[in-house]
Amino acid sequence: TQHGIRLPLRSGLGGAPLGLRLPRETDEEPEEPGRRGSFVEMVDNLRGKSGQGYYVEMTVGSPPQTLNILVDTGSSNFAVGAAPHPFLHRYYQRQLSSTYRDLRKGVYVPYTQGKWEGELGTDLVSIPHGPNVTVRANIAAITESDKFFINGSNWEGILGLAYAEIARPDDSLEPFFDSLVKQTHVPNLFSLQLCGAGFPLNQSEVLASVGGSMIIGGIDHSLYTGSLWYTPIRREWYYEVIIVRVEINGQDLKMDCKEYNYDKSIVDSGTTNLRLPKKVFEAAVKSIKAASSTEKFPDGFWLGEQLVCWQAGTTPWNIFPVISLYLMGEVTNQSFRITILPQQYLRPVEDVATSQDDCYKFAISQSSTGTVMGAVIMEGFYVVFDRARKRIGFAVSACHVHDEFRTAAVEGPFVTLDMEDCGYNIPQTDESTLMT
């Protein structure tokens, strides 16, 4: 998966894996029964927080073994801890499952820092707070790992929801969601509402709190406000999209739009930060610094290394700008924009020294592998991964953190020409060297 600050390894610097107005969804004819509306049984089925990932409860094997599994739209393997590890409360015990089948094949997944490796097999899998189905899916049983599991995160595996092209060891290993759609009547679509708390959560609070919803097979209208706007999935590997413009407080960054997508732009629930290509990051930080110049922050803050703290309840949200990303729309010559607040890109963290203060980390960071729209972006929106129609939808999340003056927004349409030219074409030779 991605370089740099990616769940499941922490979001500190050293971390690694981690036009026409579109009709509102309710105005459209459902393509499959049960595709839209209310999915009460799946609402609030996620827990966690942006810094350590959002997880869903799953069961594996017969009799079912319950595990918490990180939801990751930036990878394509279903992989679970299958051996004792100091950070795991429980793990998948293949020998106790009568339905486990060994594929007699290993898998090794290295990251910039850290890795996991394991043995491939298949077993019966279900999601208790998901569709009422059981599927036989590929499972990577993690037998060895380094800097992968997070102490106190409360998850024991990872559910890669992206496409087969980036599955390990190769694209012949069918991802979980493909198996689910093939073996059941579940529509080829899922949607995510990740709810940032807006304040740091301790271990017991994470366990007690709701982290959001993963709606499998549909769209729940109670989870968003306003309209859903769709951007095409450029290519089915990661969930790749095209950004055509970036604004800080309404001021255009004025870069060649190819820079925004160099070498790709992806939507990745398994990454904490909004990660931007080097040139874009530098321009964005310069602009954010200028907009927030009434207060001075150390360089370490902008690098994501240092916290900034204010007396509880006095965070000056108003001095920080909003950030807008314009995405290619579905209609020719039409784009739309998603706008996030500092409440999304300043990540609350616990200050060990004092609990009297509200402390934050700057959750925008530099990338050498393109733009990654991680939890920082996703926590502002209800995001629909409409695989059936090769598009991703964004609407303002009903649970996003905001204040009385500003709110996250999804707005359009904007007339935009030659958007296809904003995409970067990765040279063929590079694709085989996807060293995560």
Epitope: R245, D252, D256, K258, F414, V415, T416, L417, D418, M419
Partner: nanobody, 127 residues
Framework: QVQLQESGGGSVQAGGSLRLSCAAS????????ISWFRQAPGKEREGVAA????????FYADSVKGRFTISQDNAKNTVYLQMNSLKPEDTAIYYC????????????????????WGQGTQVTVSS
């Protein structure tokens, strides 16, 4: 040097018409888009209409669709904005602007995309 000169502004009653002209001179290379923008007192500059100098492709802001028409006369290097059914909310200074080079992800109704601007002409619509 490069110049854009607007003319045709003035005062008119609601429901009336005006025709603005933008004469372009000094351009050594072809112009990609020419647009009309307007700015009312205390408001941001907003895109009204845009035309591609080559193919005559046009775009309009929702607020003026069906009332305003942008056109060009290449022989005279002039772009026109025909404004019909004028409303008091159309009162503003109207500017024409030119963008020279074709860029990917071009927003024809966004002022930040344009490098050359005229001085503006006042349009006042009274009720």
């Amino acid at each position: 040097q490069v110049q854009l000169q607007e003319s045709g502004g003035g005062s008119v009653q609601a429901g009336g018409s005006l025709r603005l002209s933008c004469a372009a001179s000094g351009f050594t290379s072809s112009v990609y888009y020419i647009s009309w923008f307007r700015q009312a007192p205390g408001k941001e500059r907003e895109g009204v209409a845009a035309i591609n100098s080559g193919g005559g492709i046009t775009f309009y802001a929702d607020s003026v669709k069906g009332r305003f028409t942008i056109s060009q006369d290449n022989a005279k290097n002039t772009v026109y904005l025909q404004m019909n059914s004028l409303k008091p909310e159309d009162t503003a200074i109207y500017y024409c602007a030119a963008a020279l080079s074709r860029v990917p992800g071009f927003f024809p109704l966004f002022p930040s995309q344009y490098n050359y601007w005229g001085q503006g002409t006042q349009v006042t619509v009274s009720s």
